[in-house]
Amino acid sequence: PPNRRTCVFFEAPGVRGSTKTLGELLDTGTELPRAIRCLYSRCCFGIWNLTQDRAQVEMQGCRDSDEPGCESLHCDPSPRAHPSPGSTLFTCSCGTDFCNANYSHLPPPGSPGTPGSQGPQAAPGESIWMAL
């Protein structure tokens, strides 16, 4: 398809590595949210860290290729990793402009489908890339 995908771009302070090189940051006239136009895919992603009381965005941007899940119109996150006890990383992929701005819903921590508390543990920076 000819038109390029545009996604929300965000990287939380302290996140190791960057997906900035997967697109071209746009001047949207506002400080936030930032927008990125994808170079290598038509697919956005988002990563949220869900703890007992809140969900915090960790990363948003472009994927490096089109993969299963990229055909989704909306961001429907699924659990991917445990950066620390009591928190779970959820990721989504989707294929419409700015579809990664927010998620449609997150299952509550510990609900079916969430990795068990004995799931893989990782250092915070590593867990982001595990999730991706």
């Epitope: 390029r4 071209e24 001047d27 006239g29 927008a35 170079l39 290598y40």
Partner: antibody, heavy 117, light 111 residues
Framework: QVQLQESGPGLVKPSETLSLTCTVS?????????WNWIRQFPGKGLEWMGY???????SYNPSLKSRITISRDTSKNQFFLQLSSVTAEDTAVYYC??????????WGQGTLVTVSS | DIQMTQSPSSLSASVGDRVTITCRAS??????????MHWYQQKPGKAPKLLIY???NLESGVPSRFSGSGSGTDFTLTISSLQPEDFATYYC?????????FGGGTKVEIK
């Protein structure tokens, strides 16, 4: 700095496959960038042919999609162009180019390929 | 594909002249207000050299006498005071849609 150098035969027979190599120095082709092939016809028109990305994904100009393959050898820091079933209309100067964004900041010097029997 | 039309196809000018080259796209090359139009200079026997990216941004090392402007479908490359080394062919390129496409070129010759 990033440097690119094209190499390959300057003469190809009609219906055969054109094969070119681009050797990149000063930068790893797996680090970043799209690695492109662009050609310039004798009438001076420029055509973007396609790229292989740092991650190995490819994108091709639809006008060439049935005939073009771009691949790479990461151990040699090279990427390749294959264009099958060539005709005289494929006679051109072929450039490889590196792009961090969607414009072309780094170019090879170009190599002339003539298609003739 | 987006068609890029440059005008004029050639022009004659003298050192010190102000030169303007235009490029018109068959459809808008803007994404959310950002113009994906770029300009190159090519001298005989050499590869094209990037001058301007995203309509108006000067590539590092390019003299400030070169400037770009425009949005949507109509763009302009201006050389404020033509120098002897500026006699060359100039191309525009859009990257708003795949496949990337180039204009046919404008040859700037010595009057």
């Amino acid at each position: 700095q990033v440097q690119l150098q094209e190499s390959g035969p300057g003469l190809v027979k009609p219906s055969e496959t054109l094969s070119l190599t681009c050797t990149v120095s000063g930068y790893s082709i797996t680090s970043d960038f799209a690695w492109n092939w662009i050609r310039q016809f004798p009438g001076k028109g420029l055509e973007w042919m396609g790229y292989i990305s740092f991650s190995g994904s490819t994108s091709y100009n639809p006008s060439l999609k049935s005939r073009i393959t771009i691949s790479r050898d990461t151990s040699k820091n090279q990427f390749f162009l294959q264009l099958s079933s060539v005709t005289a209309e494929d006679t051109a100067v072929y450039y490889c180019a590196g792009s961090r964004y969607s414009w072309f900041a780094y170019w090879g010097q170009g190599t002339l390929v003539t298609v003739s029997s | 594909d987006i068609q890029m039309t440059q005008s004029p196809s050639s022009l004659s000018a003298s050192v010190g002249d102000r030169v303007t080259i235009t490029c018109r796209a068959s459809e808008s090359v803007d994404t959310y207000g950002n113009s994906f139009m770029h300009w190159y200079q090519q001298k005989p026997g050499k590869a094209p050299k990037l001058l301007i990216y995203r309509a108006s941004n000067l590539e590092s090392g390019v003299p400030s006498r070169f400037s770009g402007s425009g949005s949507g479908t109509d763009f302009t490359l201006t050389i404020s005071s033509l120098q002897p080394e500026d006699f060359a062919t100039y191309y525009c390129q859009q990257s708003n849609e795949d496949p990337y496409t180039f204009g046919g070129g404008t040859k700037v010759e010595i009057k």
